[in-house]
């Protein structure tokens, strides 16, 4: 198949990086993550016709362009700049679903209600999706001992810079009614530190974006506080308020129905607040 | 100031080949994509080739293009060149070379082209 | 394949007119608003003037405005001048980088 040909026409030799070398805090890169990444970037450009002229190996030439040789501790966004490019994907701009420390129900949610969009579901998020990876300066080996930690070792490696980067355009693409996905079961259910709190907050266009609409998920059954009235609701509220842009706010005090009615939206229990 | 110059055009046989060249000079090459794109006689634009350089050859094509036409560069002369195999008469047209910086809010678009290069492509 | 069309395909105008070009994706482009307009005269390479749909390039003059999103865009001349005489190009931006072009209006002198 085609990514047979693309393995054959290079023979990658991934070598690891020694066990003496520069010992970082955080796991080291994904086992086989050459062969995942352009595994992933073959199925998805299967998959999504509009997507399909797109060349996985120039795809993974650039994503090995972004950290290959380079200090796991200097990545900069124009390292990944032509991965970018390359990845621009036009998803529909008003069907947008943004994520803070909720990923699963996200996801869920997208594969049912499948005109709407995480970052995920877009080529370059798909293919980065679990992923860790980083090199090291001037050789061209790929580390799969350690990578930089984002506390304990720098915030400007590999793996951050990526979803940086790439939550910010996905942010910039963004249009009319954004919804975003909030887990109201941690301490910070709006946590200005989160990448939807640092990077996609204020990425949004205000000259595109009319609404942010935050669905604050419920955990325990019993729940039925307003959740939209927390401290850090009304800090966010705040933040896009100055932004002028509208928002609004909903409890999902039962996510597991809500999975279901988005399934089944006749069923006559869904008339209900989920 | 920024210059993009185009060579190589001319008159060439069907099913021949041409390599076209693009000189670039008032600016650094590598934090720009240069791009290939043509006119044919009368009609109106159309994208061929894209390669970006700024460590190891990032290159992609218009759907139309893969196969016959190959983008390459030499950073130490600041040159980008497009071989076209296979040539067919409809490949007639001027051949321009632009670039694109290369930055999310400047990308998808072309601010400085060159004066562009004819290719006829007839027997 | 994405189709850009322009309309109209020639438009003639006299000095001081205001003139309106359109510019219909068959997809929408990418952002909602990455689209651009290119002026070009007989010989020379096309000069850009607008980016992402509203955007004055450099040194383009004022009389200039563009706006639209997602599949329609319009390039309007509020003021036409003698300098203005030429053909338009619209050009969007794409999933996977890639470009098209629309097939140019011909602005000329009534």
């Known amino acids: 198949s085609g990514l047979n040909d693309i393995f054959e026409a290079q023979k990658i030799e991934w070598h690891e990086v020694p066990r003496w070398r520069q010992q970082w805090s955080g796991p080291g890169t994904t086992k086989r993550f050459p062969e995942t990444v352009l595994a992933r970037c073959v199925k998805y450009t299967e998959i999504h016709p509009e997507m399909r002229h797109v060349d996985c190996q120039s795809v993974w030439d650039a994503f090995k362009g972004a950290f290959i040789s380079k200090h796991p501790c200097n990545i900069t966004e124009e390292d990944y700049q032509p991965l970018m490019k390359l990845g621009t994907q036009t998803v529909p701009c008003n069907k947008i679903l943004l994520w803070s420390r909720i990923k699963d129900l996200a996801h869920q949610f997208t594969q049912v209600q499948r005109d709407m969009f995480t970052l995920e579901d877009t080529l370059l998020g798909y293919l980065a999706d679990d992923l860790t990876w980083c090199g090291e300066f001037n050789t061209s080996k790929i580390n799969y001992q350690s990578c930089p930690d984002w506390r304990k070792d720098c915030s400007n490696n590999p793996v951050s810079v990526f979803w940086k980067t790439v939550s910010r355009r996905f942010a910039e693409a963004a249009c009319d009614v954004v919804h975003v996905m909030l887990n109201g079961s941690r301490s910070k259910i709006f946590d200005k530190n989160s990448t939807f709190g640092s990077v996609e907050v204020h990425n949004l266009q205000p000259e595109k974006v009319q609404t942010l609409e935050a669905w604050v998920i419920h955990g325990g059954r019993e729940d039925s506080r307003d959740l939209c009235q927390d401290p850090t609701i009304k800090e966010l509220e705040s933040i896009i308020s100055k932004r002028n842009i509208q928002f609004s706010c909903k409890n999902i005090y039962r996510p597991d129905k809500f999975l279901q009615c988005v399934k089944n939206p006749e069923d006559s229990s869904c008339t209900s607040e989920i | 100031e920024v210059q993009l110059l185009e060579s190589g055009g001319g008159l060439v046989q069907p099913g021949g080949s041409l390599r076209l060249s693009c000189a670039a000079s008032g600016f650094s090459f590598n934090n720009y994509w240069i791009i290939w794109i043509r006119q044919a006689p009368g009609k109106g634009l159309e994208w061929v080739a894209a390669?970006?350089?700024?460590?190891?050859?990032?290159?992609y094509y218009a759907d139309w293009a893969k196969g016959r036409f190959t983008v390459s560069k030499d950073n130490s002369k600041n040159t980008v060149y497009l071989q076209m195999n296979s040539l067919r008469a409809e490949d007639t047209a001027v051949y321009y070379c632009a670039r694109e910086l290369a930055g999310s809010s400047y990308e998808g678009y072309f601010e400085s082209w060159g004066q562009g290069t004819l290719v006829t492509v007839s027997s | 394949d994405i189709q850009l069309t322009q309309s109209p395909s020639t438009l003639s105008a006299s000095v001081g007119d205001r003139v309106t070009i359109t510019c219909r994706s068959s997809?929408?482009?990418?952002?909602?608003?990455?689209l651009a307009w290119y002026q070009q005269k007989p010989g020379k390479a096309p000069k850009l003037l607008m980016y992402?749909?509203?955007n004055l390039a450099s040194g383009v003059p004022s009389r200039f405005s563009g706006s639209g999103s997602g599949t329609e865009f319009t390039l309007t001349i509020s003021s036409v001048q003698p300098d203005d005489f030429a053909t338009y190009y619209c050009?969007?931006?794409?999933?996977?980088?890639?470009?098209?072009f629309g097939g140019g209006t011909k602005v000329e002198i009534k």
């Open positions: 992402r749909a509203s």
């Open positions: 390669i970006y350089s700024p460590s190891g050859d990032i290159k």
């Open positions: 997809q929408s482009v990418y952002g909602h608003n990455w």
């Open positions: 050009q969007g931006y794409y999933s996977g980088g890639s470009y098209a």
